[in-house]
């Protein structure tokens, strides 16, 4: 009798059950980025290693060609870090009519592209102005949240300037994924 | 019949599954910093509150020595923010033969330690420079993701200046690590 | 026979096992601020999109008036971003007898509110000193931690200047938590 | 001390390919991209792409690519250079370069090969 | 596609001090990583004198050093000596991360 009052909710939730083990799960690390034109308004994407050192991809999550592809609908969290690197900012030295002058920036963008949807949506963005003072510069913009993504949905990073990107270690720069 | 069509797959994906609620988790928050000797290339590793306020430690993640120790192999998210603050770092004001020196910086690393591997492993670093002008300054930097780790792994907190952090309230300088 | 043996494990471990599609999640993005009284020692707290664009709540978890309810005894992952935006900060440039004045800073601040207790409690701090020369700035700032979190209590987001925060885009600014 | 040490002078006919080494020593081979650099005779340098030596990854100069091919050997601590189809304006010498991995600049170099293409 | 502009060729007597510029038809010259400058004396492979605008590598004497200004960087060279003959060359990366060169100035030392 326990047997059968215990049967339709085991077989009501059992379902979505799924083991955490089997979930879709990256994560990126960065590598120097191969020389590309790319247009003057479009913040160029990053590309990634996915197998050497800390990166992985695992259970259908797959890299390729600069994207993140999402293998099975649900929630995600998303995250990456972009460490920028610079020579000096000049900004605050130049100046119109005694006036300050646009601020030189960095930004990151984490976008997701649909192949139904025309437009890119930007899931996220970090960007903040750089105006140093007599000296390199170098600063980390992290990003991470939770989105709900559609099977086929890719992922990739955007940034305002590829070549302050510093691709020196994986542990500075990079982005990763996984099913919640 | 129905339950005998339903046996095989529940005993196919039965074992790896788990409660949420008995997972390993951390959240370690900052306390003062006993003086401790360092290696002058070796940046110093912050210890923590495991028990007090915010920070627990639950589902045998345990917190020793400065270390949290990994007690099941699996995919982590691991995360910290350490709150930096100091007096005015005058590196842009001096100036060798009118060139600016090299900049101030600020430094957190999240370590892992393998027994069995000689070297430490720098999963997560967050370096910025600093250079601020004419006042006292504070910032956190904060870094968070996902990384394969094995039973017996130990994750510490590295940082390039223990004495710039910011040790007074625990929601500031945190440090925590959970399975997915 | 087999069966029998089985039951046990299954009917000990199965109560706490749960589908993650129905775990409380909640992401919500910026909207701009409605002009509000607050303290003048309280930083004011941040209202946002829970439907709209990328915004979102789900499983029972609500947001209300400022609020994120929590519906369920649990761990959380807690984050937030707040992108700041100002005009020149001189506060290098203004001495009082010759000493560094206070510098201007923007605060970000996760708060929880469990209405058995008087005071609420502060989860996550993310401070930073501004003291740009020359410019226009902005920057985000970013916290993300595990809380354990009891059914009732309430999230929200202060911060030190409301004036300051870029409500533009629904990805520079944002708050979430979700049941681990 | 770090030294890279090229291969010999080569002499090819147009349409041909030449394969120039890079052997390095006094370093962690893995731990510095290599660059590969020319100049021809009474010209400027020319830059014609990185290469990683520990992930094999490259990186060309837009005016080479598809033509050039950049290969290291970690088990001898050897970079290597190929380039196809030449032509006459291919006649160089051609210098591999280590660099410097914060700020990309080339602190060391190799001896430099002559590479004389004519028919 | 930048372009970095040196003077075909500058000289100066023993003793002296000679500039050598370097300047990008892009606004953010060596914005990323700075702009280096290497030494060729004849029949040698180049030699790093200068990195990152400023910097000197060890065993680079101190008559050498870098400056920046605008979209322009600059190799001043004091106390002159007959072995400073050669040619100087600016180096920068661009927005795409090709390596750019100057087309080099050719320094003769007068005497």
């Known amino acids: 009798l326990k047997g059968q009052e215990f049967a339709p909710s085991h077989q009501q939730v059992y379902a979505p059950l799924r083991a955490d083990g089997d979930k879709p799960r990256a994560h990126l690390t960065v590598v120097r980025q191969t020389p590309t034109q790319h247009f003057k308004n479009q913040f160029p994407a990053l590309h990634w290693e996915h197998e050497l050192g800390l990166a992985f991809t695992k259970n259908r999550m797959n890299y390729t060609n600069k994207f993140l592809l999402i293998p099975e609908s649900g929630d995600y969290f998303i995250y990456s870090q972009v460490t920028f690197r610079g020579m000096t900012s000049e900004c605050s030295e130049i100046r119109q009519a005694g006036r300050p002058n646009k601020p030189d920036s960095i930004t990151v963008v984490i976008t997701k592209v649909t192949d139904s949807y025309p437009e890119p949506t930007q899931l996220l963005m970090g960007t903040k102005s750089v105006c140093e003072v007599g000296s390199n510069w170098f600063q980390p913009i992290y990003l991470g949240a939770m989105f709900s993504l559609q099977e086929g949905d890719k992922l990739m990073v955007n940034v305002s300037d590829i070549s302050l990107v510093d691709y020196t270690k994986e542990d500075k720069t990079f982005f990763g994924a996984f099913l919640l | 019949l129905k339950g005998q069509e339903f046996a095989p797959s529940h005993q196919q994906v039965y074992a790896p599954l788990r409660a949420d609620g008995d997972k390993p988790r951390a959240h370690l928050t900052v306390v003062r910093q006993t003086p401790t000797q360092h290696f002058k290339n070796q940046f110093p590793a912050l210890h923590w509150e495991h028990e007090l306020g915010l920070a627990f430690t639950k589902n045998r993640m345990n917190y020793t020595n400065k270390f949290l120790l990994i007690p099941e192999s699996g995919d982590y998210f691991i995360y910290s923010q350490v709150t930096f603050r100091g007096m005015t770092s005058e590196c842009s004001e001096i100036r060798q033969a009118g060139r600016p020196n090299k900049p101030d910086s600020i430094t957190v690393v999240i370590t892992k330690v393998t027994d069995s591997y000689p070297e430490p492993t720098q999963l997560l670093m967050g370096t910025k420079s600093v250079c601020e002008v004419g006042s006292n300054w504070f910032q956190p930097i904060y870094l968070g993701a996902m990384f394969s780790l094995q039973e017996g792994d130990k994750l510490m907190v590295n940082v390039s200046d223990i004495s710039l952090v910011d040790y007074t309230k625990e929601d500031k300088t945190f440090f925590g690590a959970f399975l997915l | 026979l087999k069966g029998q043996e089985f039951a046990p494990s299954h009917q000990q471990v199965y109560a706490p096992l749960r589908a993650d599609g129905d775990k409380p999640r909640a992401h919500l993005t910026v909207v701009r601020q409605t002009p509000t009284q607050h303290f003048k020692n309280q930083f004011p707290a941040l209202h946002w999109e829970h439907e709209l664009g990328l915004a979102f709540t789900k499983n029972r978890m609500n947001y209300t008036n400022k609020f994120l309810l929590i519906p369920e005894s649990g761990d959380y992952f807690i984050y937030s971003q707040v992108t700041f935006r100002g005009m020149t900060s001189e506060c290098s440039e203004i001495r009082q007898a010759g000493r560094p004045n206070k510098p201007d800073s923007i605060t970000v601040v996760i708060t929880k509110v469990t209405d058995s207790y008087p005071e609420p409690t502060q989860l996550l701090m993310g401070t930073k000193s501004v003291c740009e020369v020359g410019s226009n700035w902005f920057q985000p700032i970013y916290l993300g931690a595990m809380f354990s979190l009891q059914e009732g209590d309430k999230l929200m987001v202060n911060v030190s200047d409301i004036s300051l925060v870029d409500y533009t885009k629904e990805d520079k600014t944002f708050f979430g938590a979700f049941l681990l | 001390q770090v030294q890279l040490v090229q291969s010999g002078a080569e002499v090819k006919k147009p349409g041909a390919s030449v394969k120039v080494s890079c052997k390095a020593s006094g370093y962690t081979f893995t731990s510095y991209d290599i660059n590969w650099v020319r100049q021809a005779p009474g010209q400027g340098l020319e830059w014609m792409g990185w290469l990683n030596p520990n992930s094999g990854y490259t990186g060309y100069a837009q005016k080479f690519q598809g033509r050039v091919t950049m290969t290291a050997d970690r088990s001898t601590s050897t970079a290597y250079m190929e380039l196809s189809s030449l032509r006459s304006e291919d006649t160089a010498v051609y210098y591999c370069?280590?660099?410097?991995?914060?700020?990309?600049?080339?602190?060391?170099w190799g001896q430099g090969t002559l590479v004389t293409v004519s028919s | 596609q930048s372009v970095l502009t040196q003077p075909p060729s500058v000289s100066g007597a023993p003793g002296q001090r000679v500039t050598i510029s370097c300047t990008s038809s892009?606004?953010?010259?060596?914005?990323?990583?700075?702009v280096h400058w290497y030494q060729q004396l004849p029949g040698t492979a180049p030699k790093l004198l200068i990195e990152g605008y400023y910097n000197r590598p060890s065993g680079v004497p101190d008559r050498f050093s870098g400056s920046k200004s605008g979209t322009s960087a600059s190799l001043t060279i004091t106390g002159l000596l007959p072995e400073d003959e050669g040619d100087y060359y600016c180096q920068s990366w661009d927005g795409t991360l090709s390596a750019l060169f100057g087309g080099g100035t050719k320094l003769t030392v007068l005497g």
């Open positions: 370069a280590r660099e410097v991995p914060e700020t990309a600049a080339f602190e060391y």
């Open positions: 892009s606004s953010d010259i060596g914005a990323g990583l700075g």
